[in-house]
């Protein structure tokens, strides 16, 4: 039952507002950026070097034939397999005010299936047996979503969004910087 | 060339006083986070606070809240520790560590600088 | 006693594959991204790894990272006499909301 064929295509996913706990800040004031003296980027920056690509939750397309013993559906199917790496900061416009991306270790999100789909399926089977019909449960889409203390990796195709809980000692709301300071934090995270 | 420089260090008696800074050069400042981590002698590393582009994003470690403020100057392209009522467990060598805002990992770090708690 | 669990220590020959564990709780590991620290004697802490399994460029391909529910663990395949250093794993701690570190484990090459 491996994957047979070939990739269609791959779709970026951005995750819902609804997977971070915290609210953005207004973006109010012209934070000015201050370059240290030699200026530049430090080298060996963990994602200097990375394809963007590599660190999103993509929907590859894959067609494969389903089986089920001896028997074969007469026509592939579609499917989609979720893919990559989720950073919050990175995908989510406004992110930045969201939960304390400051921090050297953050929200951790997985590219995890979102909805399924069932899909009627004719096996064809050898022998002169009759053909069989069959429902298939296939991946329809895919999200990136956080992990939270009430589920682990085995669970994760079946958790839902984080439940809310109060934070310790929650900071003052963040004098943000511009905008175009701001857009330039969302390009990697996590 | 990248370079956090520590300073500030030094031998100190239980319950003054003592302010340590670091110098940063060679990345841009403001897309920094830094950090305090210190390690005491032949022990592990210990994450003391972490201060995000300015005042409204700081942490600190239970063992030192209360004790110790940290704070940054960007136009000085400067961080500090401002330690007050020293102990003897706070002996150790006091490391100054950033990471890009919003990426994970402290990539950046300087060589420390040791307090010395002692009578 | 450290917020993260590390063996003490660890050892292998050259060549060899060697494992070092980090167990954790729902509110670091199991929830946060984890990074892990190399410290050569006498020198700063270096970033290994961050977020769960990623290598910061100039990092070899022969140190690699994972997580699984609350605990990750480091590999490091094809042991070389310069990977002898103390390897730390960290998180950040929700509950704590500090950065916590494992006790560190050290790693001979025999």
């Known amino acids: 039952q491996g994957w047979q064929a070939f990739k269609n295509d791959a779709t970026e996913i951005i995750p819902e507002l609804g997977e971070y706990p915290e609210p953005p800040p207004e973006l109010e004031n012209n934070k000015t950026m201050n370059r240290a003296e030699n200026g530049g980027r430090p080298p060996h920056h963990p994602f200097e070097t990375k394809d963007v690509s590599e660190y999103s939750c993509r929907e590859l397309h894959f067609t494969r034939y389903v089986t089920d013993g001896p028997c074969r559906s007469a026509k592939p199917v579609t499917e989609l397999v979720c893919s990559g790496q989720c950073g919050p900061a990175r995908l989510l416009p406004n992110a930045i005010g969201r939960g304390k991306w400051w921090r050297p270790s953050g929200p951790d999100f997985r590219c995890i299936p979102d909805r399924y789909r069932a899909q009627r399926v004719q096996l064809l089977c050898p022998g002169g047996e009759a053909p069989r019909a069959r429902k298939v449960r296939l991946v329809a889409s895919c999200k990136c979503k956080r992990l939270t203390r009430f589920h682990n990796q085995s669970e994760l195709k079946d958790f839902g969004t984080e439940a809310a809980r109060p934070q310790k000692g929650r900071k003052p709301r963040p004098r943000a910087r511009s905008a175009k300071a701001n857009q330039a934090e969302l390009e990697n995270a996590y | 060339e990248v370079q956090l420089v520590e300073s500030g260090g030094g031998l100190v008696q239980p319950g003054r006083s003592l302010r340590l800074s670091c110098a940063a050069s060679g990345f841009t400042f403001e897309d920094y986070a830094l950090h305090w981590v210190r390690q005491a002698p032949g022990k592990g590393l210990e994450w003391v606070s972490g201060?995000?582009?300015?005042?409204?994003?700081?942490d600190y470690a239970d063992s030192v809240k209360g004790r110790f403020t940290i704070s940054r100057d960007n136009a000085k392209n400067s961080l500090y520790l401002q330690m007050n009522s020293l102990r003897v467990e706070d002996t150790a060598l006091y490391y100054c560590?950033?990471?890009?805002?919003?990426?994970?990992?402290?990539?950046?770090w300087g060589q420390g600088t040791t307090v010395t708690v002692s009578s | 006693q450290s917020v993260l669990t590390q063996p003490p220590s660890a050892s292998g020959t050259p060549g060899q594959r060697v494992t070092i564990s980090c167990s954790g709780s729902s509110s670091n590991i199991g929830t946060n991204t984890v990074n892990w620290y190399q410290q050569l004697p006498g020198t700063a802490p270096k970033l290994l790894i961050y977020s769960n399994n990623q290598r910061p460029s100039g990092v070899p391909d022969r140190f690699s990272g994972s997580k699984s529910g609350t605990s990750a663990s480091l590999a490091i395949s094809g042991l070389q006499s310069e990977d002898e250093a103390d390897y730390y794993c960290?998180?950040?701690?929700?509950?704590?909301?500090?950065?916590?570190f494992g006790g560190g484990t050290k790693l001979t090459v025999l």
């Open positions: 560590a950033g990471n890009k805002i919003g990426y994970g990992g402290l990539d950046v």
């Open positions: 960290a998180a950040w701690d929700d509950q704590l909301e500090a950065y916590v």
């Open positions: 201060i995000g582009w300015d005042r409204d994003f700081i």
